[in-house]
């Protein structure tokens, strides 16, 4: 059975940022700004055809 | 530090797991200058199909 879509789980550390409780709350400015930067970054990295998007962004302490 | 976890979606057959990781790793320097994000410890794996079917992209 094929959906025509491949999914990849990706994890990485951002070593120059500090985790705090606002990254557990999607309504905070800190969460939304980081999510926006990361989403924009991935659109830059995979700008060649085939990239459909990203989902399920989660932040946790390093 | 902050650990980021996410799911990426691609049209099937357009990229292999090695290139997902390689292209991301090659962008780390630009990520630091453009977004002020210092990225390390990158890990990529493919998501098994049953999970994939439940994960909307974008």
């Amino acid at each position: 059975l094929s959906t025509g879509v491949s999914f990849f789980f990706l994890s990485f550390h951002i070593s120059n940022l500090q985790f705090n409780s606002s990254l557990e709350d999607p309504s905070t400015d800190y969460y939304q700004e980081l999510q926006r930067d990361i989403s924009e970054m991935f659109l830059q990295i995979y700008k060649q055809g085939g990239f459909l998007g990203l989902s399920n962004i989660k932040f946790r302490p390093g | 530090s902050v650990v980021v976890q996410l799911t990426l979606a691609f049209r099937e057959g357009t990229i292999n797991v090695h290139d997902v990781e390689t292209q991301f790793n090659q962008y780390k320097t630009e990520a630091a200058s453009r977004y002020n994000l210092t990225i390390s410890d990158v890990s990529v794996s493919d998501v098994p199909f049953p999970f994939s079917a439940q994960s909307g992209a974008g």
Epitope: S6, Q48, G49, G50 | E12, G13, T14, I15, N16, V17, H18, T22, Q26, D46
Partner: antibody
Framework: QVQLVQSGAEVKKPGASVKVSCKAS????????MHWVRQAPGQRLEWMGY????????HYNQKFKDRVTITRDTSASTAYMELSSLRSEDTAVYYC?????????????WGQGTLVTVSS | DIQMTQSPSSLSASVGDRVTITCRAS??????LVWYQQKPGKVPKLLIY???TLTDGVPSRFSGSGSGTDFTLTISSLQPEDVATYYC?????????FGQGTKLEIK
């Protein structure tokens, strides 16, 4: 037409190094990844590593990581593979092989091969 | 590392026969599977990529199928010029491993 022309056969002593060249023509050298593959007598093909000539990014098979170096000279449209600390089991035909362009996961053109013989 | 195992290692068939070669990956490689043909003393030649896409200029008697871990190369009607060793290759993740080859001969 696309051509990959490799350097000639080499005979080396154990412990020595060998550097094989692969001159590309008929396409834009910097837009296609170049891989190196070897084949020992009667054995399967074995992938060694690659270089992206545009970015100079390299990736090696861990089996050869400490002994292989892949480089390129964009002005000469040539890729090189150097293997050091040679031993008898490195006796093989060494091929350069071009990977197809974006989202093309295959080797579409191969060099003619370079026989490297390691013998004391 | 993903191990690629082909079967059989060698086979002998008659002209006109239908020939099937299988390739099994030790892990899921999706459809990132390539088939090459290598004639004696020659350079490997690309036959099929993405498990089932035939390369330009390859006769239509060749076909590929499979996904995940199990793949098949089929020659629908064997011809004398098909005598060669056939290799499958994992192109999902590094190292991009090859099968041990299947040597095909004419009876």
């Amino acid at each position: 037409q696309v051509q990959l022309v490799q350097s000639g056969a080499e005979v080396k002593k154990p412990g020595a190094s060998v550097k094989v060249s692969c001159k590309a023509s008929g396409y834009t050298f910097t837009t296609y990844t170049m891989h190196w593959v070897r084949q020992a007598p009667g054995q399967r093909l074995e992938w060694m590593g690659y270089i992206n000539p545009g970015s100079d990014y390299t990736h090696y098979n861990q089996k050869f990581k400490d002994r292989v170096t892949i480089t390129r000279d964009t002005s000469a449209s040539t890729a090189y593979m150097e293997l050091s600390s040679l031993r008898s089991e490195d006796t093989a035909v060494y091929y350069c092989a071009r990977q197809g362009n974006y989202a093309a996961y295959y080797f579409d053109y191969w060099g003619q091969g370079t026989l490297v013989t390691v013998s004391s | 590392d993903i191990q690629m195992t082909q079967s059989p290692s060698s086979l002998s068939a008659s002209v006109g026969d239908r020939v099937t070669i299988t390739c099994r990956a030790s892990g899921n490689i999706h459809n990132f599977l390539v088939w090459y043909q290598q004639k004696p003393g020659k350079v490997p030649k690309l036959l099929i990529y993405n498990a089932k896409t035939l390369t330009d200029g390859v006769p239509s008697r060749f076909s590929g199928s499979g996904s995940g871990t199990d793949f098949t190369l089929t020659i629908s009607s064997l011809q004398p010029e098909d005598v060669a060793t056939y290799y499958c290759q994992n192109f999902w993740n590094v190292p991009f491993t090859f099968g041990q080859g299947t040597k095909l001969e004419i009876k």
